[in-house]
């Protein structure tokens, strides 16, 4: 009788070790995704940023989705969403038309069950980039803590993406699981 | 015989509790560094910063080392990296050599089994810092989400390092895990 | 007796599920406060932020407390926190008194046991605001990873005030537990 | 409709000075980016100069920067070329030209002007 | 600087045809930061393509242009009268921007 009791307290511990550690790993979605600059759209104004790399060198994703553009949620519960966006100008890649700039970003999510799109963060600095100098450089940096449904989406948005920093290094946005929805 | 079969299962959930307590600390590594500025190299080019404190103040590390000037992973896993870097300016300190400045951070991984160097991370800002104004200020925040494995070095690189704010709460950075690798 | 030790293990595998859920959810405290801009001070000077949403649009709470302008901790434990804040300027909100500026942010932490307030975290930037240019815009952020205990509270303080964005995509700061104090 | 109408162009010596104007019309000028193109007769198009809106920067192709000037006056819708050291191969039709002001950087132009013919001889 | 080289230098067709122009840069446009200009003699230039494939404003929808990196093409696809005339390309991606000689497309 005690050795059977033994046998059924070994499983229960082999069988909790792997479902603790498997419902860890399934509880905990991620996404970082980079810039693909083959696809950078040009203008002035304010555009969705589609083309993202989520599989080669840092950009990488688990347990969410990467479709037309938007990083979407798989799995209810609150992320923590960061962006971090790099502008960049050097004279021999033509000359600006304005020293006045708005350098922005703005992480909007979409719910599809309720057409609506809302921004959760912005960031960025109107600049007054001279054509005096040769070379200029901006970065945002932009983070939150926020409730994501299964099936909302995640976009970039920017000004200026012609100015956009192509280096993986400089421009990307990404989001993991911090705990479950109560 | 059901006595015993009780006696079992507090001492499965005994285990479990002292278990998962356990395990989730020993799976949770991170570090907060902050900047040791009795010795931050002069210059304007770009240069590793290696003199840290990882235990006085709000400066703290646990299951990872901090050795040479870089902060190495103890643990394979899924990190949160972040920094924040200031740098600053007062006409006391005596004229700039150039009011025209670039305020940058580079935070890189170092993988000793390959010799290799990458830049995980980059932000800043391109600065005209007049002679006008008796004061500047400019900081970067940077983070991002990705894998290291055990072994990996994280190091801070940065331009014009004799700028760099020597507080605690203006030039730090660190990391800390958030999942294992699957 | 086998029937009644599998019904044993049920009940082992039941409460350890609960516990395990119940458990990590109450180990996670969160906050994400956005500004609340019916009551921001005037002013260029430093000031404490004390009109914080906690309960609409992108706000939320959890196992923390805000309270006077602060935010509570409840829980021992490693926080990671975050602000954004966005300073804002249209040429139609009257003129600026000065065109040079301090944009800042600190993000501090006070202790009611030993009465005292220390600066974690701060960022920001000196600009330029011309009277040139009909709009001005600039965002810092902030991120760290610090210890806190409970009854300590977080607090921010901003110079200019005046010059807020007062979205709640722009303005916030935040807060989630990563894990346990040894 | 958007006009442009430059003149001031003229026979000038090698050495010498010309300053050219472009009086503009039909939109918001201050709002737009500028540029003076040039077309040696019988030849291709060659750019010259811009400058952006308010007039802050201003850009020059290698072959004239140092001789030449492009300024703007904004109040008058007026763009200038100031032309100095004028040698024998500045011979050409200057022709004024928009840039369209919808890119960051300055990009294509539209409309032209119809040119003014500037000829340097001795 | 980035150098625009057109082909053929003249190109003899019959109205009605169809007129393919070449663009060849010397290095790749960023952006695909191309424009195509047409002008008479005794004209200003006027805009026929941005953007490497954009068509301006009141222009024909028999004007055409493609590609990327470093090789454009402007394509009438069927020649009026109104025509016949020397078409530039113009490259805006890097500085200074640049033209190519020019491609003369005549009557036949």
């Known amino acids: 009788g005690s050795q059977h009791i033994r046998a059924e307290k070994a499983m229960v511990d082999g069988s909790w070790l792997d479902l603790a550690k498997r419902s860890k790993l399934e509880a905990q979605p991620f996404a970082h995704l980079t810039i693909n600059a083959t696809d950078i759209p040009s203008g002035s104004h304010k555009v969705s940023l589609s083309s993202w790399y989520h599989d080669r060198g840092w950009a990488k994703i688990s347990n969410m989705t990467f479709s037309n553009g938007k990083l979407i949620v798989n799995q209810d519960g609150f992320y923590y969403l960061y962006a971090n966006i790099c502008f960049r100008h050097h004279e021999t890649s033509g000359d600006l038309a304005t020293e006045y700039l708005q350098l922005m970003v703005y992480v909007t999510k979409t719910s599809i069950k309720i057409p609506s799109s809302h921004t959760l963060m912005k960031g960025g600095s109107t600049k007054y980039w001279s054509g005096n100098s040769e070379f200029h450089f901006y970065s945002i940096n932009v983070g939150g803590f926020f409730k994501l449904r299964s099936g909302e989406e995640i976009s970039i948005e920017v000004s200026n993406p012609s100015l956009l920093d192509p280096d993986q290094d400089a421009t990307y946005f990404g989001a993991f699981k911090v705990r479950d929805i109560d | 015989g059901s006595q015993h079969i009780r006696a079992e299962k507090a001492m499965v959930d005994g285990s479990w509790l002292d278990l998962a307590k356990r395990s989730k600390l020993e799976a949770q590594p991170f570090a907060h560094l902050t900047i040791n500025a009795t010795d931050i190299p002069s210059g304007s080019h770009k240069v590793s910063l290696s003199s840290w404190y990882h235990d006085r103040g709000w400066a703290k590390i646990s299951n990872m080392t901090f050795s040479n000037g870089k902060l190495i992973v103890n643990q394979d896993g899924f990190y949160y990296l972040y920094a924040n870097i200031c740098f600053r300016h007062h006409e006391t300190s005596g004229d700039l050599a150039t009011e025209y400045l670039q305020l940058m951070v580079y935070v890189t991984k170092t993988s000793i089994k390959i010799p290799s160097s990458h830049t995980l991370m980059k932000g800043g800002s391109t600065k005209y810092w007049s002679g006008n104004s008796e004061f500047h200020f400019y900081s970067i925040n940077v983070g991002g989400f990705f894998k290291l494995r055990s072994g990996e070095e994280i190091s801070i690189e940065v331009s014009n390092p004799s700028l760099l704010d020597p507080d605690q709460d203006a030039t730090y950075f660190g990391a800390f895990k958030v999942r294992d690798i699957d | 007796g086998s029937q009644h030790i599998r019904a044993e293990k049920a009940m082992v595998d039941g409460s350890w599920l609960d516990l395990a859920k119940r458990s990590k959810l109450e180990a996670q405290p969160f906050a994400h406060l956005t500004i609340n801009a019916t009551d921001i001070p005037s002013g260029s000077h430093k000031v404490s932020l004390s009109s914080w949403y906690h309960d609409r649009g992108w706000a939320k709470i959890s196992n923390m407390t805000f309270s006077n302008g602060k935010l509570i901790v409840n829980q021992d434990g490693f926080y990671y926190l975050y602000a954004n804040i966005c300073f804002r300027h249209h040429e139609t909100s009257g003129d600026l008194a000065t065109e040079y500026l301090q944009l800042m942010v600190y993000v501090t932490k006070t202790s009611i046991k030993i009465p005292s307030s220390h600066t974690l975290m701060k960022g920001g930037s000196t600009k330029y605001w011309s009277g040139n240019s009909e709009f001005h815009f600039y965002s810092i952020n902030v991120g760290g990873f610090f210890k806190l205990r409970s009854g300590e509270e977080i607090s921010i303080e901003v110079s200019n005030p005046s010059l807020l964005d007062p979205d709640q995509d722009a303005t916030y700061f935040g807060a989630f537990k990563v894990r346990d104090i040894d | 409709e958007v006009q442009l109408l430059e003149s001031g162009g003229g026979l000038v010596q090698p050495g010498g000075s010309l300053r050219l104007s472009c009086a503009a019309s039909?939109?918001?000028?201050?709002?737009?980016?500028m540029s003076w193109v040039r077309q040696a007769p019988g030849k291709g198009l060659e750019w010259v100069s811009g400058?952006?809106?308010?007039?802050?920067?201003?850009y020059y192709a290698d072959s004239v920067k140092g001789r030449f000037t492009i300024s703007r006056d904004n109040s008058k819708n007026t763009l200038y070329l100031q032309m100095n050291s004028l040698r024998a191969e500045d011979t050409a039709v200057y022709y004024c030209?928009?840039?369209?002001?919808?890119?960051?950087?300055?990009?294509?132009?539209?409309?032209w002007g119809q040119g003014t013919l500037v000829t340097v001889s001795s | 600087e980035i150098v625009l080289t057109q082909s053929p230098g003249t190109l003899s067709l019959s109205p009605g045809e169809r007129a393919t122009l070449s663009c060849r840069a010397s290095?790749?446009?960023?952006?695909?930061?191309l424009a195509w200009y047409q002008q008479k003699p005794g004209q200003a230039p006027r805009l026929l393509i941005y953007?490497?494939?954009s068509r301006a404003t009141g222009i024909p929808d028999r004007f055409s242009g493609s590609g990327s990196g470093t090789d454009f093409t402007l394509t009438i696809s069927r020649l009026e009268p109104e025509d016949f005339a020397v078409f530039y390309c113009?490259?805006?991606?890097?500085?200074?921007?640049?033209f190519g000689q020019g491609t003369k497309v005549e009557i036949k």
């Open positions: 400058i952006t809106g308010s007039g802050g920067s201003t």
């Open positions: 953007g490497a494939s």
């Open positions: 290095q790749s446009v960023r952006g695909r930061y």
């Open positions: 030209a928009k840039d369209p002001g919808t890119t960051v950087i300055m990009s294509w132009f539209d409309p």
């Open positions: 039909g939109f918001t000028f201050s709002a737009y980016p």
């Open positions: 113009q490259q805006y991606g890097s500085s200074p921007r640049t």
